[in-house]
Interface confidence: low
C-alpha cells in the first residue's frame, strides 16, 4: 500500500506565439482545480478499466480576476498535493491523465459552471520511494508544470511497496543508519543506497549498489539520453576518447515522441511507436475512451472501448459541453413570460409569476377584475397585472368603500373656501377670484 502524490507547480500560457487569453475575466472571475486519473501502464486488462489505480480531485484554487490589458499570467493554484492512495503493489509503469478545470463564479442562477481547460496524459516509469520527478506537459497553448512521486505507507517498503517492515522492539540493537525490518525480529537491513553518482532523476535501484535506468535513459549512471548514446548510431565523427562514433544530430534526438512514445529512425525521418491510448505523428493526441470516464454529471458515454475509438458524451438535461461539464443556464433563454422570475432548480425550471399571471411559464394573463367588485357604484379597470377601481364621486380607496372628503385635498385656489356637497364640492371664492376652483 502507498500513496501517489502530485504537486502542480504552475499552469499558464506556454511559450511561443498564440498565447491564450486568461480563462477568467473581470466580468466572470474563476478559479482552477485539477483532476488526476491513474492507470497501470503495462497491464492490457487494467488499461481498459477507468482510473484503475485511482483518481483524485484537488481543492479549488484562489479566485482569479483578469486585469484588463495585462498578459495572461500563471494562474493561482489550489494549495496542497493531489494524493491517490493505492492498496496493492505499485506497478512501476503507469499512465496518467491530468485535467485542468475552470470553475466560473458568475452570478448565474443554479450555481457555478465548470469547463475543461486542458488535458495532458502520459506514461511513465516510476519506482516507489524515489525522489520527486519533474515534468512539463503542453496542451494546446497551455503549459502545465508538475512533480510526482510514489511513496509506500508503513509497514510497506521497496520499489513496489510489497515488502513489509515493522519497527523492532529494540531498535538500539541495530547500528547507526540501519533500519529494522522483519522477516526476523533481530535482522537489521541497511537503507537502500544506489551506486554512487546514479542519477536521482533518471535512475533507481532495487538492490544496494545498482543503478537501473528509467525509460529513455542509459549509461552506467543513467545520465545519457537513449537517443544520444554513443556507439549506437553509425552517424557522426569519431570520438577521440572512446574510439566510438559520436552521433550527429538525428531525427530522434531530443525524442520527438510525446507521452512516452518510442522513436525509431526511418530512411526519410522518424517514426513514433505510441503507447496504448495515444496516436498522431508524435503520439501527441490522447485517445481518451469511455473507459476513462470522461463524461461528467451523469452523461452517457458512447464510443468504442478501445483507445483508438473517439467518444461522445450524451448529456442529461441541464448540462452541456463535450464532457457534460457545463451547467446549462436555462434561465438565460428567458423562458418566463410577462416579467416572471426564473428559478433553475437543477432538476427543473420554475417561473415565479407576477400578480395577474399564471401557468408554468407565466403565459396566462388572468382576468384581473374576475370576482372583484367595486363598491358604491365604482367600476373595475383591468391592467398591469392588478385590478383598480374607478370610484364614483365622493368615494375612494382600493374598493371604493371609503367615503371621500372632497375638500381634503384643498382644491379651492387663492384662499377660496371649500364646501362638501352631495354632488361633489363647491368653492366659495375670495373677492376678486372666480371659477369652479377659484383659479381665475
Amino acid at each position: 500500500a502507498g500513496v501517489f502524490e502530485l504537486q502542480i507547480h504552475s499552469f499558464g500560457p506556454g511559450p511561443g506565439p498564440g498565447a491564450p487569453r486568461s480563462p477568467c475575466s473581470a466580468r466572470l472571475p474563476c478559479r482552477l482545480f485539477f483532476r488526476v486519473c491513474l492507470k497501470p501502464g503495462l497491464s492490457e486488462e487494467a488499461a481498459e478499466s477507468p482510473c484503475a489505480l485511482g483518481a483524485a480531485l484537488s481543492a479549488r484554487g484562489p479566485v482569479y480576476t483578469e486585469q484588463p490589458g495585462a498578459p495572461a499570467p500563471d494562474l493561482p493554484l489550489p494549495d496542497g498535493l493531489l494524493q491517490v492512495p493505492f492498496r496493492d503493489a505499485w506497478p512501476g509503469t503507469f499512465s496518467f491523465i491530468i485535467e485542468t478545470w475552470r470553475e466560473e463564479l458568475g452570478d448565474q442562477i443554479g450555481g457555478p459552471a465548470w469547463s475543461l481547460l486542458a488535458r495532458v496524459a502520459g506514461r511513465r516509469r516510476l519506482a516507489a520511494g524515489g525522489p520527486w520527478a519533474r515534468d512539463i506537459q503542453r496542451a494546446g497553448a497551455w503549459e502545465l508544470r508538475f512533480s510526482y512521486r510514489a511513496r509506500c505507507e508503513p509497514p510497506a517498503v521497496g520499489t513496489a511497496c510489497t515488502r513489509l517492515c515493522r519497527p523492532r522492539s529494540a531498535p538500539s540493537r541495530c547500528g547507526p543508519g540501519l533500519r529494522p525490518c522483519a522477516p526476523l525480529e533481530d535482522e537489521c537491513e541497511a537503507p537502500l543506497v544506489c551506486r554512487a553518482g546514479c542519477s536521482p532523476e533518471h535512475g533507481f535501484c532495487e538492490q544496494p549498489g545498482e543503478c537501473r535506468c528509467l525509460e529513455g535513459w542509459t549509461g552506467p549512471l543513467c545520465t545519457v539520453p537513449v537517443s544520444t548514446s554513443s556507439c549506437l548510431s553509425p552517424r557522426g565523427p569519431s570520438s577521440a576518447t572512446t574510439g566510438c562514433l559520436v552521433p550527429g544530430p538525428g531525427p530522434c534526438d531530443g525524442n520527438p515522441c510525446a507521452n512516452g512514445g518510442s522513436c525509431s529512425e526511418t530512411p526519410r525521418s522518424f517514426e513514433c511507436t505510441c503507447p496504448r491510448g495515444f496516436y498522431g505523428l508524435r503520439c501527441e493526441v490522447s485517445g481518451v475512451t469511455c473507459a476513462d470516464g470522461p463524461c461528467f454529471n451523469g452523461g452517457l458515454c458512447v464510443g468504442g472501448a478501445d483507445p483508438d475509438s473517439a467518444y461522445i458524451c450524451h448529456c442529461p438535461p441541464g448540462f452541456q459541453g463535450s464532457n457534460c461539464e457545463k451547467r446549462v443556464d436555462r434561465c438565460s433563454l428567458q423562458p418566463c413570460r410577462n416579467g416572471g422570475l426564473c428559478l433553475d432548480l437543477g432538476h427543473a425550471l420554475r417561473c415565479r409569476c407576477r400578480a395577474g399571471f399564471a401557468g408554468p411559464r407565466c403565459e396566462h394573463d388572468l382576468d384581473d377584475c374576475a370576482g372583484r367588485a367595486c363598491a358604491n357604484g365604482g367600476t373595475c379597470v383591468e391592467g398591469g397585472g392588478a385590478h383598480r377601481c374607478s370610484c364614483a364621486l365622493g368615494f375612494g380607496g382600493r374598493d371604493c368603500r371609503e367615503r371621500a372628503d372632497p375638500c381634503a385635498a384643498r382644491p379651492c385656489a387663492h384662499g377660496g373656501r371649500c364646501y362638501a356637497h352631495f354632488s361633489g364640492l363647491v368653492c366659495a371664492c375670495a373677492p376678486g377670484y372666480m371659477g369652479a376652483r377659484c383659479e381665475f
Epitope: A118, A139, G140, A141, G280, V285, S286, S322
Partner: nanobody
Framework: QVQLVESGGGSVQAGGSLRLSCAAS???????MAWYRQAPGKERELVSR???????NYAASVKGRFTISQDNAKNTVYLQMNSLNPGDTGMYYC????????????WGNGILVTVSS
C-alpha cells in the same frame, strides 16, 4: 456548429470498390478525422483515422484494402474502399476530433454501404 456531410455510400458487388467522402465545417483546431462503421447488431468500430499531420491507422480487417486520405484545403477526408466483401456492410460514420486539447468529438449522420455476394 460543427457539421459533417458524408457521401459516396451505396450498394456494390463483392470485390467492387467505393469511395466515401466527408466534408467538415464549423470547427477550429482539428486533431484528426476518422471513419467508423457499425454492422447490424454490432458495436461501432474504428475503420481508419488520419491526423492533421497525416498519420494514419487502420483496423486490422481493412488493412491493405482501404486507404484514408485528406484534402486539407477542402476540409475533406476520403475513404477509398477496394476488394469489398459482405463483412464490410454497415453504416459508415465520419467523425472529427477538434479542440486545443483534442477532446471535442463530433459525428456525422452516417451513410449506408451494402456489399452483396
Amino acid at each position: 456548429q460543427v457539421q459533417l456531410v458524408e457521401s459516396g455510400g451505396g450498394s456494390v458487388q463483392a470485390g467492387g470498390s467505393l469511395r466515401l467522402s466527408c466534408a467538415a465545417s464549423g470547427y477550429t483546431d482539428r486533431c484528426s478525422m476518422a471513419w467508423y462503421r457499425q454492422a447490424p447488431g454490432k458495436e461501432r468500430e474504428l475503420v481508419s483515422r488520419i491526423s492533421t499531420s497525416g498519420f494514419t491507422n487502420y483496423a486490422a480487417s481493412v488493412k491493405g484494402r482501404f486507404t484514408i486520405s485528406q484534402d486539407n484545403a477542402k476540409n475533406t477526408v476520403y475513404l477509398q474502399m477496394n476488394s469489398l466483401n459482405p463483412g464490410d456492410t454497415g453504416m459508415y460514420y465520419c467523425a472529427i476530433i477538434v479542440g486545443r486539447t483534442c477532446s471535442l468529438n463530433y459525428w456525422g449522420n452516417g451513410i449506408l454501404v451494402t456489399v452483396s455476394s
